[in-house]
Interface confidence: low
């Protein structure tokens, strides 16, 4: 009876006492049929929640209540009495200490301690039978009945619903007989409930409702399995496609078997030639937790083709979570020669199953949506790569993702699949033994996809040098080496110690490739970032140039006229960042097509005019070429004395 | 590829939005009390009280009889008329506070908020599978009742719970009422009492045993009686009340009060605190 931990729910909202069924009696450690007081408690008068559920239900066995009261009387009235133990009930009587009667100093010989009202000093503590599962529900009415060996709480709620729930402590979900709305008014169900025969009477607003003790019906059970697992007293049976009581569908009502129910399957397509491992999902497949299927009981057909049941892989067996149910069934589909391409049905028939605890499985379930398809391989690229492997092959075609298995074989060795889609497969080639042309094939579902393809293993590319040792976004890099064209693309990557960026080189010569630096943002426009610049060809060994300087790109000024004073023989213009990249890329400055021996002073470029240069009436164009990319910055003109341009 | 079936939530096997239509009765006003009767000869009834009216329904929830229980002072009040002519108290609506069966007779007893909380006894008359109420008897003897001692003042307008117990040939009414200072001053109902129904159905025997909230606590200490029942040798009341007479009156807890069902006395009145918790 001592208080335990947990959140107190001190305010009783409704109560009812009733004898309990065998199962709950066992859980409460009392005898079946013993009277138990059930109370719905809330946290306060307003019933508003703190944390935790709105309503909780506690069970107090009457015999235990009486024992606690009798023990409390003993503590008050039998020697030795604990000093300071109060009789209590000070709102009814004068305060006093045990064993004295109210208001008196001490007992007189003709009065007994037991003959006066008493508040027992200890409380009777219990925890929520429903483990908080009533959640937001605010219970406003309660009546408890025993049905067979089951104890059922019939509860009315604040929003005008009736919940009929088995009272059981050991579960972490609610076992509902029913949960339904009394009407559309949504008014609270009132506290007092009465029983009349096999019905309970609940009041809500100005209405009285008569609810069968065994529940209002079975239509809220949506699946045959759930229907036939319902309590016997509910009288539920399966009526072909709904759960009902016998009077609702006397012609089709039965309680002995459920058909299997297919809800989903995977995959939704398979190859016309070759096998597919089909996974069927649903319920009422075998009713055995181990997933064992008795011989010859389950027949799966897809279109005209049989699907051979497979034993369940024990490593893949997963416990079905408390609030979920799903069954899986696997079979191997090998299409018949007569099977046609196109959409078809998946059908599961279960027969001759031994009866389960609640029913046996018997019947057929059909689901549309499987398609037989013919994979077609249209293109493969590249058809060559280094002996080291690692070439990313792209196979293009149709229906390449059908079924459950596919393999790209290069000279009989699997090419590791990186990506699979309906129209494209990506895989990385395995290493080759020698430089040679070898067969390349695609298998789907173990059957070869038509088409004859050859892959050429070439000598591994060898990178010997990378130059220059600096650059900026998209600036050119030269790679020198041997067999550089063996790879479909050389990949250039820059790594700053934190992240890497990559670009692909266009194929040119076996000994030399011209590449562009990848996109990389140098945050500080005045600075640069040092890192490693690497070049590699597919799976072959690469080459790394350490200490590569990645610079911000130079910014050309806007184009305009460049006027010269009479005494000037050199042009000065600003070109931010150009001086910094002068060691990394080729820079050429021309005026009127003639090259000038430019020099840098910070961000200023000084270009001495060539002696042979003739500036005409319109001047001459000033052009700067950086890494092969040319910009006309303006026209060089020499104004006359009155400011009008004139020729020299 | 290791594809797994998506799990189906357990809740997907049930639909609690399915509409069920169950038999119902429209009482014409907010239902204040309801009690059922099942006789030995397959006769049964449902009694439904609303303000100023008592409905008698058959087992099919069809109306069999309807009785006006108020307003007090209104010439149409059928129960009031059973107390004879003359004004019996201030006029006003009758809200039914007690509706119980006395299984010994058998009879229905109803007590309301008007006429000092007095009760009326309606003998049950079986008619086939249905039941009718005989003319009501007024359980009030004017010469026995005073404002400071009123054995026939049973119902409190603040709420009353009654359990009827047969002891020998007599019916004892175990009554628990919520009080405040104003209610206590008017024909002095008690918090807890045991009253014997007089054999001539003229009211309750005087000199009944009772406990009441002491006058000094009436303002701050209110007891709500939530439920009462009889099992074995005891009658039990369930209350919600302040945890202490001295501390914050809004700090409530729940108690069970136990009374002897075999001896109509209150010396062995016991209370026990019921503690219900949620342990996540």
């Amino acid at each position: 009876g001592a208080p335990e931990g947990g959140q107190p729910y001190p305010v009783l909202r409704v109560a009812h006492s009733a004898p309990v069924g065998a199962q709950l009696a066992t859980e409460l450690s009392i005898a079946e049929g013993q009277e138990v007081l059930f109370g719905v408690f809330v946290t306060g008068k307003d019933g508003g929640p703190g944390v935790g559920p709105n309503s909780v239900v506690c069970a107090f066995p009457i015999d235990l209540l009486d024992t606690l009261i009798d023990e409390g009387v003993e503590r008050c009235c039998e020697s030795p009495v604990h000093p300071g133990l109060r009789r209590g009930l000070d709102f009814f009587q004068s305060p006093s200490f045990c064993p004295n009667p109210p208001g008196l100093e001490a007992l007189s010989p003709n009065t007994s301690c037991r003959h006066f009202p008493l508040l027992v000093s200890s409380s009777f503590s219990r925890v929520d039978l429903f483990n908080g599962l009533l959640g937001p529900v605010q219970v406003t009415a309660l009546y408890v009945t025993r049905l067979d060996n089951v104890t059922v709480a019939h509860m009315g709620t604040m929003d005008g619903r009736i919940l009929q729930v088995e009272l059981v402590r050991s579960l972490n979900y609610l076992l509902y007989v029913s949960n339904f709305s009394l009407g559309d008014s949504g008014q609270p169900v009132q506290r007092d409930v009465s029983r009349l025969g096999d019905h309970l009477l609940f009041a809500s607003g100005d209405q009285v409702f008569q609810v069968p003790i065994q529940g209002p019906g079975c239509r809220h059970f949506l699946t045959c399995g759930r229907c036939l697992r319902a309590w016997h007293f509910m009288g539920c049976g399966w009526c072909g496609n709904m759960c009902g009581q016998q009077k609702e569908c006397p012609g089709s009502w039965q309680q002995d078997h459920c058909p299997p129910k297919l809800t989903e399957f995977h995959p939704h397509s398979g190859p016309l030639r070759g096998s597919t491992r089909l996974t069927l999902c649903g319920s009422n497949f075998y009713l055995h937790p181990s997933g064992l299927v008795p011989e010859g009981t389950h027949q799966v057909t897809v279109g005209q083709s049989p699907c051979r049941p497979l034993p369940k892989d024990s490593s893949k067996l997963r416990p079905v979570p408390r609030k979920d149910f799903v069954e899986e069934f696997e079979c191997e589909l090998e299409p018949l020669g007569t099977q046609a391409v196109g959409p078809t049905n998946v059908s599961l028939t279960v027969t001759n199953m031994p009866p389960g605890k609640h029913f046996r499985v018997d019947g057929t379930s059909v689901l549309r949506g499987f398609s037989f398809m013919e994979p077609v391989l249209i293109a493969v690229q590249p058809l060559f790569g280094p002996r080291a492997g690692g070439t990313c092959l792209t196979l293009e075609g149709q229906s390449l993702s059908v079924g459950t298995s596919r393999a790209v074989l290069v000279n009989g060795t699997e090419c590791l699949l990186a990506r699979v889609s309906e129209g494209q497969l990506l895989c990385a080639t395995p290493p080759g033994a020698t430089v040679a042309s070898v067969p390349l094939s695609l298998q789907v579902g173990g059957a070869q996809v038509p088409g004859s393809w050859t892959f050429q293993y070439r000598e591994d590319p060898v990178v010997l040098s990378i130059s220059p040792n600096c650059g900026y976004i998209n600036s050119h890099i030269t790679i020198c080496g041997q067999h550089l064209t063996s790879a479909w693309h050389l990949v250039l990557s820059f790594h700053d110690g934190l992240r890497a960026v990559e670009s692909r080189c266009e194929r040119q010569l076996p000994e030399q490739q011209l590449c562009r630096l990848p996109e990389y943002v140098v945050r500080d426009p005045q600075g640069w970032v040092a890192g490693n610049l690497s070049a590699r060809g597919d799976g072959a060994a690469g080459f790394t140039l350490p200490g590569f300087r990645f610079l911000p790109p130079p910014h050309p000024p806007s184009a305009n006229l460049v006027p010269l004073k009479p005494e000037e023989h050199a042009i000065k213009f600003e070109y931010i960042g150009l001086g910094a990249v002068a060691d990394c890329v080729g820079i050429n400055v021309t005026v009127g097509g003639e090259s000038c021996q430019h020099e840098f002073r910070g961000d200023m470029v000084v270009c001495p005019l060539p002696p042979s240069l003739q500036l005409g009436q319109d001047g001459a164009p000033l052009q700067v070429c950086v890494d092969g990319e040319c910009h006309i910055l303006g026209r060089v003109v020499r104004p006359g004395p009155d400011g009008v341009p004139q020729s020299t | 590829e290791d594809w797994q079936c998506p799990r189906t939530p357990y809740a997907a096997s049930r639909d609690f939005d399915v509409k069920y239509v169950v038999p119902s009765f429209s009482a014409g006003g907010l239902v204040q009390a309801m009690v059922t009767y099942e006789g030995d000869r397959n006769e049964s009834a449902v009694f439904v009280a609303i303000r100023n009216r008592l409905h008698v329904l058959g087992p099919d929830l069809k109306s069999v009889q309807s009785l006006a229980t108020g307003p007090a002072g209104d010439p149409g009040c059928q129960t009031c008329a059973a107390c004879g002519p003359g004004p019996h108290g201030p006029p006003g609506d009758t809200d039914t506070k007690v509706l119980v069966l006395d299984p010994a007779l058998p009879a229905l007893v109803s007590c309301g908020s008007s006429l000092q909380g007095r009760c009326f006894l309606h003998d049950l008359e079986p008619q086939g599978t249905a039941v009718h109420l005989a003319a009501p008897a007024c359980l009030f003897s004017a010469h026995h009742n005073r404002p400071d001692d009123c054995p026939d003042c049973v119902a409190s307008p603040l709420g009353t719970r009654v359990t009827v117990v047969e002891q020998g040939q007599a019916s004892y009414f175990y009554v628990a009422s919520s009080l405040d200072a104003a209610v206590a001053a008017s024909f002095s109902p008690r918090s807890v009492s045991i009253r014997r129904l007089k054999a001539d159905a003229s009211g309750f025997a005087p000199g009944f045993v009772a406990l009441s909230v002491l006058p000094k606590h009436l303002v701050s200490y209110s007891i709500e009686y939530v439920h009462s029942f009889h099992t074995g040798a005891f009658v039990y009341f369930l209350t919600v009340q302040p945890a202490s007479v001295t501390d914050d009156p809004s700090a409530l807890h729940t108690r069970l009060a136990r009374l002897s069902a075999t001896e109509p006395e209150l010396g062995d009145y016991r209370e026990l605190v019921l503690d219900c918790r949620f342990a996540p």
């Epitope: 959640g135 937001p136 619903r161 709305s181 | 797994q4 799990r7 939530p9 639909d15 939005d17």
Partner: antibody, heavy 116, light 108 residues
């Protein structure tokens, strides 16, 4: 075309009340559960409440339990969120979203500001 | 309650780049995971449900994968319109349904 049109936002004082609405069209409203999700300024998404198609099941986040009530009027294809005892931390954009677990369509959002 | 931890909290990526966002659950959530996109100033939009199923009208460059506690959203080739915040959402154990804290994706 599935559409969820929201209304009812605005400025409310702390301790005040407000009712948000979400009018649905383009699908069978009573067949789908509905959610409310909110987003406080410069914060992430926070789930608030859920109600099933026929109002038989509802869930609330602990932060709003006892203060907010989710309801729906199926004949009028409308979802509601009644908010009481509002606090400054309830300031957010409130979105309604369709379906039980797969929140496949979302409303445009309505802004609630709780401030004195 | 189940906690979803998203990484990174923000990232920059180039157009055309392959982008992957990670979502880790505090316990096994049995593939009951959605990915939701929210573009600046707009309402959220569901991209992926049940960990790897593409929602209606979502471009095929988006894909989801994972199992147990670890899930990822991949954009195979980033486009400008993919800029926004991406949230994961679990519905294995509820209430409550819980969202990840979000990953802000910006274009370099």
């Amino acid at each position: 075309e599935v559409k969820l049109e929201q209304s009812g936002g605005g400025l409310v004082q702390p301790g005040g009340s407000r009712k948000l609405s979400c009018a649905a069209s383009g699908f069978t409203f009573s067949s789908f559960g509905m959610h409310w999700v909110r987003q406080a300024p410069e914060k992430g998404l926070e789930w608030v409440a859920y109600i099933s198609g026929g109002s038989g099941t509802f869930y609330y986040a602990d932060t709003v339990k006892g203060r907010f009530t989710i309801s729906r009027d199926n004949p009028k294809n409308t979802l509601f969120l009644q908010m009481t005892s509002l606090r400054s931390e309830d300031t957010a954009i409130y979105y309604c979203a369709r379906s039980t677990t797969v929140l496949d369509y979302w409303g445009q959002g309505t802004t609630l500001t709780v401030s004195s | 309650d189940i906690v979803l931890t998203q990484t990174p909290s923000s990232m920059y990526a180039f157009l055309g780049e392959r982008v992957t966002i990670i979502c880790k659950a505090s316990q096994d959530i049995n593939n009951y995971l959605n990915w939701v996109q929210q573009k600046p100033g707009k309402a959220p939009k569901t991209l992926i449900y049940h960990a790897d199923r593409l929602a209606d009208g979502v471009p095929s460059r988006f894909s989801g994968s994972g199992s147990g506690q670890d899930y990822s959203l991949t954009i195979s080739s980033l486009e400008y319109e993919d800029m926004g915040i991406y949230y994961c959402l679990q519905y294995d154990d509820f209430p409550p349904f819980t969202f990840g804290s979000g990953t802000k994706l910006e274009i370099k």
